[in-house]
Interface confidence: medium
């Protein structure tokens, strides 16, 4: 089978596909499983070791424009007795994911994929000890 | 959906909303290039809830690797480097948004597809249930 | 255990073409991405272009523009790279290289080179 | 394109001794910057991801830090199997750039 050339996909397109401009792609932005709904825990975030706290920031031109954003709450972590043990970490667990944002040039707008970064939780770590030689 | 300002010298055409199909260029933009990836990526290790990398492949999907956290204890590692059952390892779940290949196998057309993964573990104080 | 295997060595006339081929295995090809990066006799590493074949696109050093060419074959898992317009210039070592483009322990861990090919000499002489 | 520049050029060090190699952005990259090692007459190998993270299977002498601009390599402990020539690259913004190199010999 003979390659195709750049800006085709390896493998048969099917005749079917949209027609799509050079240099962009596609994007349905009606999100597959929408409704499906996060199961953790409850509470985790106050009965960790490592509690954190939520803060919900938000951008007009990003889709979605809600993101939700994890703080520790301590430096270290909570040990049996309910105070903060500083010789443990509460160290934050970050997650990326793909957002959609919208550019204004003048009147016209165009839209880019783009990578954001979300600190979803917090764990608790044995710290890293660094011996000075 | 969600509405923005528009530039009031522009015809009014523009939905305010975002639209349901929209072309978008074709790099991903990385914001995070200042701290990417600031992780410490032993802390799966270093965790008192510790967690396996388990991998999700799936070729039809953007980024088709996934690689997912199961954490490794039901309890937590305490002091002594002890499971202890006292405590619970829970994982931290996250909704993210991929890209699907839509209609599969057209090359440059996709659809975002939200998908629970498991980032991490924490540990919790267990909820004790009193049987009256 | 990801593998790249190039093709063998070429020897060219100026002004000819080379396509030298990069077959992939162990890992999901259609997933990563391949760059090619050459080396000229005692010098560094030049990156010349790169495919996701997830998205079907190339990216090209504007050096290389219009004389390189990257394709892919998701059906035999093998990359190419077609370079045409070929002077003594162009005589190196190319390598073809994989990007994981994965989502590792909550990242996309991308844009760097995990796994190299052997290496393919060519030598353009008259 | 951004251009990388690494010093020193060459280092010839004694076995277990420190090396240290620096390689610096024209511009600011964040931390995509990447280190690989390349031994004579074989293809290069990923050493360290994004500045400062380690890569599975190499040794823990190996580390690296920095970000913006400028960027460390470390060999704590240098030992013969380590001479070769050593690579910077950053990948923040097309094209993707590699330093000059900076080769390393055993004494």
């Known amino acids: 089978r003979k390659i195709p050339k750049v800006g085709h996909t390896f493998f048969q397109k099917p005749e079917s596909c949209p027609p799509v401009p050079g240099g962009s792609m596609k994007l349905d932005i009606g999100i597959i499983n929408e409704n499906q709904r996060v199961s953790m825990s409850r509470n985790i975030e106050s009965r960790s070791t490592s509690p954190w706290n939520y803060t919900v920031t938000w951008d007009p031109n990003r889709y979605p424009s809600e993101v939700v954003q994890a703080q520790c709450r301590n430096l270290g972590c909570i040990n049996a007795q309910g105070k903060e043990d500083i010789s443990m970490n509460s160290v934050p667990i970050q997650q990326e994911t793909l957002v959609v944002r919208r550019k204004h040039q003048g009147c016209s707008v165009s839209f880019q994929l783009e990578k954001v970064l979300v600190t979803v939780g917090c764990t608790c770590v044995t710290p890293v000890i660094h011996h000075v030689q | 959906g969600i509405t923005i300002p528009r530039n009031p010298g522009c015809p009014n055409s523009e939905d305010k909303n975002f639209p349901r199909t929209v072309m978008v260029n074709l790099n991903i933009h990385n914001r995070n290039t200042n701290t990417n990836p600031k992780r410490s990526s032993d802390y799966y290790n270093r965790s008192t809830s510790p967690w396996n990398l388990h991998r999700n492949e799936d070729p039809e999907r953007y980024p088709s690797v996934i690689w997912e956290a199961k954490c490794r204890h039901l309890g937590c590692i305490n002091a002594d480097g002890n499971v202890d059952y006292h405590m619970n390892s829970v994982p931290i779940q996250q909704e993210i948004l991929v890209l699907r290949r839509e209609p599969p196998h057209c090359p440059n057309s996709f659809r975002l597809e939200k998908i629970l993964v498991s980032v991490g573990c924490t540990c919790v104080t267990p909820i004790v249930h009193h049987v009256a | 255990e990801v593998q790249l295997v190039q093709s063998g060595a070429e020897v060219k006339m100026p002004g000819s073409s080379l396509k030298i081929s990069c077959k992939a295995s162990?890992?999901?090809?259609?997933?990563?991405?391949i760059s090619w990066v050459r080396q000229a006799p005692g010098q560094g590493l030049e990156w010349m272009g790169g495919?996701?074949?997830?998205?079907?696109?190339?990216d090209y050093a504007q050096k290389f523009q219009g004389r390189v060419t990257i394709t892919a074959d998701e059906s035999t898992t093998t990359a190419y790279m077609e370079l045409s317009g070929l002077t003594s210039d162009d005589t190196a070592v190319y390598y073809c290289?994989?990007?994981?483009?994965?989502?590792?322990?909550?990242?996309?861990?991308?844009?760097?080179?995990?796994?190299w090919g052997q290496g393919t000499t060519v030598t353009v002489s008259s | 394109e951004i251009v990388l520049t690494q010093s020193p050029d060459f280092q010839s060090v004694t076995p277990k001794e420190k090396v240290t190699i620096t390689c610096r952005a024209s511009?600011?990259?964040?931390?995509?910057l990447h280190w690989y090692q390349q031994k004579p007459d074989q293809s290069p190998k990923l050493l360290i991801k994004?500045?400062?993270h380690s890569v599975s299977g190499v040794p823990s002498r190996f580390s690296g830090s920095g970000s913006g601009t400028d960027f460390t390599l470390t060999i704590n402990g240098l030992e013969a199997e380590d001479a070769g020539t050593y690579y910077c690259?950053?990948?923040?913004?097309?094209?993707?750039?590699f330093g000059p190199g900076t080769k390393v010999d055993i004494k």
């Open positions: 690259h950053q990948s923040d913004i097309l094209p993707h750039t």
């Open positions: 290289a994989r990007d994981p483009n994965e989502f590792w322990n909550g990242y996309y861990d991308t844009h760097h080179f995990d796994y």
């Open positions: 511009q600011d990259i964040g931390s995509a």
């Open positions: 994004y500045a400062s």
């Open positions: 495919i996701t074949p997830f998205f079907g696109w190339a």
């Open positions: 162990g890992g999901s090809f259609r997933g990563y991405g």
